[in-house]
């Protein structure tokens, strides 16, 4: 069982190969000088039938080194940065995880490209395995909360909550969505 | 960090076969490669063959070609390489290393295991 | 099978000094390159991968460059559990390592 040859790539190079390439085979992509990498540089010969050979993945891009390109902080409800940090610059990669309890949709890393979006797939997506959710928090009296995404939320995330100024926190700042669908404790109050 | 932990050394005579574990724990089993490299006394270090378990795909560098084979159990994230047909300049301590996804590079390494090969 | 060369076989160098370890590949590798410690006993250690990236953990006086067939790895200033044996090692196609060169005290 073997591939056929990789894929090409426009202003780079694919690491040495000999053929037929057998499942197994690594090949690697770069970018010439001026061009950065966006995508996964490795790709792997599989297969998934067991008589024909396949890449497990698409090519990676070259693209022309934009300096002035940054992109955004980059947000996966329900997972945390395992590689990159601020700022963000043209080529630039972000790695994702997800927290316990949670399963990952989606390609892990993305990179930050000329345009200065994410890509060259979507963000991943942190999926609770459990089907509960918590209800969505009622707002409170003279202060208000913060959440990681709006409406019910997922076991595993959490719902912090302050006051306004001249308002004093009684209760619980942070409340963590539980796997048993329930809240960790009751909304705080604002008290003067 | 991964921490991968071989079985103990052997002792085998000219023409036999040993089989030597190495257990990953931390981390996925299924996101990386495991490699399997030895080394002679006072010698270098030599690149025999890798699997990536998730795959179950082997392959081996050509030196070893028809006499090692290298397999993994996700079950229980321990991987095996088997080296038949011994002789006396196998003596080597032989390591397992981790390469995460197929990276290409080792980011860590069993302890090592010796095996000896004598008459 | 890319067969890479290590050199010098030996380095003496002073605590404190700089030590400069090459590396060459038998064809172009581009960046693909790794370099491991090891000291007697233990199995080999990460230092740098992709010709210039340090692993984490690894201290800044360790530095690697080079790109194509030509490496090098420099510890900028020795100090005294640095004294090992030093391996690069190509991924460009498969894998292999170098012969190894041993940085001993002076």
């Known amino acids: 069982i073997s591939c056929g040859s990789p894929p090409p790539i426009l202003n780079g190079r694919i690491s040495y190969y000999s053929t037929p390439i057998a499942v197994g085979t690594v090949i690697r992509y770069s970018c010439s000088g001026t061009f950065r990498l966006i995508g996964e540089k490795s790709l792997l010969c599989i297969t998934k039938d067991k008589v024909d050979g396949t890449w497990d993945k698409p090519a990676p891009k070259c693209e022309y080194f934009n300096k002035y390109s940054s992109c955004p902080e980059p947000i996966v409800p329900g997972g945390y940065k395992i590689r990159g940090s601020t700022p963000y610059r043209h080529g630039d990669s972000v790695t994702f995880a997800c927290k316990t309890n949670f399963s990952m949709n989606g390609n892990k890393s993305v990179w930050c490209q000329a345009n200065n979006m994410w890509g060259p797939t979507r963000l991943p997506t942190c999926v609770s395995v459990f089907p509960l959710e918590c209800p969505a928090l009622p707002m409170i009296h003279n202060g208000h909360h913060t959440s990681e995404n709006v409406g019910s939320i997922a076991p595993g995330l959490s719902v912090t909550y302050s006051c306004e100024s001249g308002y004093l926190l009684v209760g619980e700042k942070i409340i963590n969505c539980l796997s048993s669908g329930k809240w960790s404790a009751v909304p705080p109050t604002c008290e003067e | 960090q991964v921490q991968l932990v071989q079985s103990g050394a052997e002792v085998k005579k000219p023409g036999s076969s040993v089989k030597v574990s190495c257990k990953a724990s931390?981390?996925?089993?299924?996101?990386?490669?495991i490699s399997w490299v030895r080394q002679a006394p006072g010698q270098g270090l030599e690149w025999m063959g890798r699997i990536i378990p998730i795959l179950g795909i082997a392959n081996y560098a050509q030196k070893f070609q028809g006499r090692v084979t290298i397999t993994a159990d996700k079950s229980t994230s321990t991987a095996y390489m088997e080296l038949s047909s011994l002789r006396s300049e196998d003596t080597a301590v032989y390591y397992c290393?981790?390469?995460?996804?197929?990276?290409?590079?080792?980011?860590?390494w069993g302890q090592g295991t010796l095996v000896t090969v004598s008459s | 099978e890319i067969v890479m060369t290590q050199s010098p076989a030996t380095l003496s160098v002073s605590p404190g000094e700089r030590a400069t370890l090459s590396c060459r590949a038998g064809q172009s590798i581009s960046r693909y390159l790794a370099w491991y410690q090891q000291k007697p006993g233990q199995a080999p250690r990460l230092l740098i991968y992709d010709a210039s990236s340090r692993a984490t953990g690894i201290p800044a006086r360790f530095s690697g460059s080079g790109s194509g067939t030509e490496f090098t790895l420099t510890i900028s200033s020795l100090q005294s559990e640095d004294f090992a044996v030093y391996y690069c090692q190509q991924y460009e196609y498969w894998y292999s390592f170098g012969q190894g060169t041993k940085l001993e005290i002076k």
């Open positions: 931390g981390g996925t089993f299924s996101s990386y490669a």
């Open positions: 290393a981790r390469e995460e996804d197929i990276s290409g590079y080792y980011q860590d």
